[in-house]
């Protein structure tokens, strides 16, 4: 069964800067990746970035840089201040779509006990939804 993992890290140099990394563990080609915060995409979450493997990348503040790391993983750097700044308990969600086969989504947040800049290696997160 395909799985999605999400890793959230606060940068030691900038406490208002977060790095979100997401990956897809499964076979099949990815047609779109959507990163959101505040909840799952389409269910109350706010879209931060959308990555298409061929047509490019779109991102919205406070997203600073979204990029593909591999064919099945992405990273997103967020920085903000004031109302647009993420906080330590913010939930980030990544959705990997493979049209028309299905989509898989998982969410994660900063580990409560983690120090800035330190985090455990990514582990598969529960699948919230699969079409």
């Amino acid at each position: 069964t395909p799985e999605v993992w999400v890793q959230v890290r606060m940068e030691a140099t900038e406490l208002s800067s977060f790095t979100i990394r997401c990956g897809f563990l499964g076979s099949g080609s990815i047609s779109l990746v959507t990163v959101s915060w505040g909840g799952p995409n389409g269910a109350g979450g706010t879209t931060l970035a959308v990555l298409h493997p061929e047509r490019g990348i779109r991102q919205w503040a406070p997203a600073r840089q979204a990029r593909w790391e591999t064919q099945s993983s992405i990273s997103l750097i967020l920085e903000g201040s004031g109302a647009s700044s993420p906080c330590a308990n913010t939930t980030f969600c990544c959705k990997f779509a493979s049209f028309p086969e299905g989509s898989w989504e998982a969410c994660g947040s900063l580990p409560p006990s983690s120090d800035p800049g330190l985090s455990a290696p990514p582990t598969p997160a529960p699948i919230l939804r699969a079409d």
Epitope: S31, L32, T34, N41, G42, A43, G44, G45, T46, T47, V50, H52, R55, G56, R58, K95, A97, F99, P100, S103, D131
Partner: nanobody, 120 residues
Amino acid sequence: EVQLVESGGGLVQPGGSLRLSCAASGYTFSTDCMGWFRQAPGKGLEGVAHIDSDGIPRYVESVKGRFTISQDHAKNSLYLQMNSLRAEDTAVYYCVVGFKFGDYCAPNDWGQGTMVTVSS
């Protein structure tokens, strides 16, 4: 949870008409576009038509003048009126909502699909 449910597919003779409907529910935000893709037997996916957030409809060349896409915001529904149908229109038709990349509507969510068969 986002749900897109298509209906209106079926068997029709060449030159005939069909109207596909898509009922959307569970969305709490606006995407860039909503439209229809199709996949003919043994073929790849093709974007048929979509409506941008600005309300402008866009069509693939092969259906221009024959297909009309429309929305009913009050009913949260999308429609595809298909006239002068041809055998090459035979496909599974998917209702999609997605994000714009140029003139392309990249599917983020979609329905289960409805089969359209054009045959005499």
